[in-house]
């Protein structure tokens, strides 16, 4: 029977700036019980505060609701680890809500072939940013990324399409079934999960000559 | 102990590339941006880019872009700073740096000379 | 790309004594979001840079409280109330608002 090892808080997420969780790896339980809480103070305070929230973000988990999330402030944050022979924290963890966000999946993705009379016929895709994220404001710059295959090919194809909310695909194998999804994330955060698929039948007519 | 471990000294031709690595240990790799930063000889200090090792999205200083890429290696806990098209003014002691979830230093590696010479 | 300046170039304290670095920036450091994101290093003689202040005025963890940060917009200050000799290095600002993130060309401290 040991004290417990050393826990490492590894992820924090927020979805839209307002709100974050942060997860913390357990250590070695010393073959014992072993209590986790989690405590911060926020930049140019001193005094401690512990976890507002253990539960919403699940197992290993600190949520901070509405009211205890600033954007203005770093967030200073360890795990301490206690069960009957003692105790052992996590190194301090330094958090700017900025750099965590995670964004949910755009909307209304939308996709067309288009095969005007004079130009080469093209795949048209338009999407919508996710709800919650508030891109008025001017700091939140969201980058799309849009992925593609025919129905039953295991590759996708991949295009990066900056902060544009409008692609156009020229190169389709004409007579296919097409997937197309497509994914966002600010420029310093992390990637939403991809959209819902979109089915897409590529006509048989669809040529790509000149 | 959060260590970020790089590859030794390297002497270049002018014209070749050069990769150096970051090795790092201590926490989990793919949690923090990792960044490269450079100093030439008596001189300060030059941000080269950035990498988020969880997906490997990067973004570099545009006065290297086409000449450096970074990359990272999720199985071994690595990153790699690769700069091609040497010229004598690239040498410099290459560092890499890691962040937290924000957009400063915290840590940094020892440092790796790249000396460029005909 | 922000330049970063700082002034002076190199300082000479005796030990005890207080001292004053200046940092000035070609732009504003306020982020969109509302930050400041002015940070200083620290090289020792042979060493890696070392993290000291980070946005403007907050000390990293294990710093002494002898380093202090202030200032807004363009102009910023470090300011070391007692040097002692394991002050001695180059002293970096750095911004990390705008990409590329940019460091002041460093000020020299050496013990008199």
């Known amino acids: 029977q040991l004290p417990p090892g050393k826990p490492e808080i590894f992820k924090c997420r927020s979805p839209n700036k307002e709100t974050f969780t942060c997860w913390w790896r357990p250590g070695t339980d010393g073959g014992l019980p072993t209590n986790y809480s989690l405590t911060y103070h926020r930049e140019g305070e001193t005094l401690m505060h512990e976890c507002p929230d253990y539960i919403t973000g699940g197992p290993n988990s600190c949520h901070f609701g509405k009211q205890y999330t600033s954007m203005w402030r770093t967030y200073i944050m360890m795990v301490n680890a206690t069960n009957q022979m003692g105790s052992s924290f996590s190194d301090e963890l330094y958090v700017d809500v900025t750099y965590i966000v995670q964004p949910d999946p755009p909307l209304e993705l939308a996709v067309e072939v288009k095969q005007p009379e004079d130009r080469k016929p093209y795949l048209w895709i338009k999407w919508s940013p996710p709800t919650l994220i508030d891109l008025k404001t001017g700091w939140f710059t969201l980058l799309y990324e849009i992925r593609l295959k025919p129905e039953k090919a295991a590759e996708w194809e991949i295009h990066f399409a900056g902060q544009q909310t409008e692609f156009k695909i020229l190169s389709l194998h004409p007579g296919q079934k097409y997937l197309v999804q497509v994914r966002c994330k600010p420029d310093h955060g992390y990637w939403s999960a991809w959209s819902p698929a979109t089915f897409i039948q590529i006509p048989s007519d669809f040529t790509m000559n000149d | 102990e959060v260590q970020l471990v790089q590859s030794g000294a390297e002497v270049k031709k002018p014209g070749s590339s050069v990769k150096v690595s970051c090795k790092a240990s201590g926490y989990t790799f793919t949690s923090y941006w990792i960044h490269w930063v450079r100093q030439a000889p008596g001189q300060g200090l030059e941000w080269m880019g950035e990498i988020d090792p969880s997906d490997s999205y990067t973004n570099y200083n545009q006065k290297f872009k086409g000449r450096v890429t970074i990359t990272a290696d999720k199985s071994t806990s690595t990153a790699y700073m690769e700069l091609s098209s040497l010229r004598s003014e690239d040498t410099a002691v290459y560092y890499c740096?890691?962040?937290?979830?924000?957009?400063?230093?915290?840590?940094w590696g020892q440092g790796t000379l790249v000396t460029v010479s005909s | 790309d922000i330049v970063m300046t700082q002034t002076p170039l190199s300082l000479s304290v005796t030990p005890g004594q207080p001292a004053s670095i200046s940092c000035r920036s070609s732009?504003?450091?306020?982020?969109?979001?509302?930050?400041?994101?002015l940070h200083w290093y620290l090289q020792k003689p042979g060493q890696s840079p070392q993290l000291l202040i980070y946005?403007?005025?907050n000390r990293f963890s294990g710093v002494p409280d002898r380093f202090s940060g202030s200032g807004s917009g363009t102009d910023f200050t470090l300011k070391i109330s007692r040097v002692e000799a394991e002050d001695v290095g180059v002293y970096y600002c750095?911004?990390?608002?705008?990409?590329?993130?940019?460091f002041g060309g460093g000020t020299k401290v050496e013990i008199k």
């Open positions: 946005k403007v005025s």
């Open positions: 750095s911004q990390s608002t705008h990409v590329p993130f940019t």
């Open positions: 732009q504003s450091l306020v982020h969109s979001n509302g930050n400041t994101y």
């Open positions: 740096a890691r962040s937290f979830f924000t957009n400063w230093f915290a840590y």
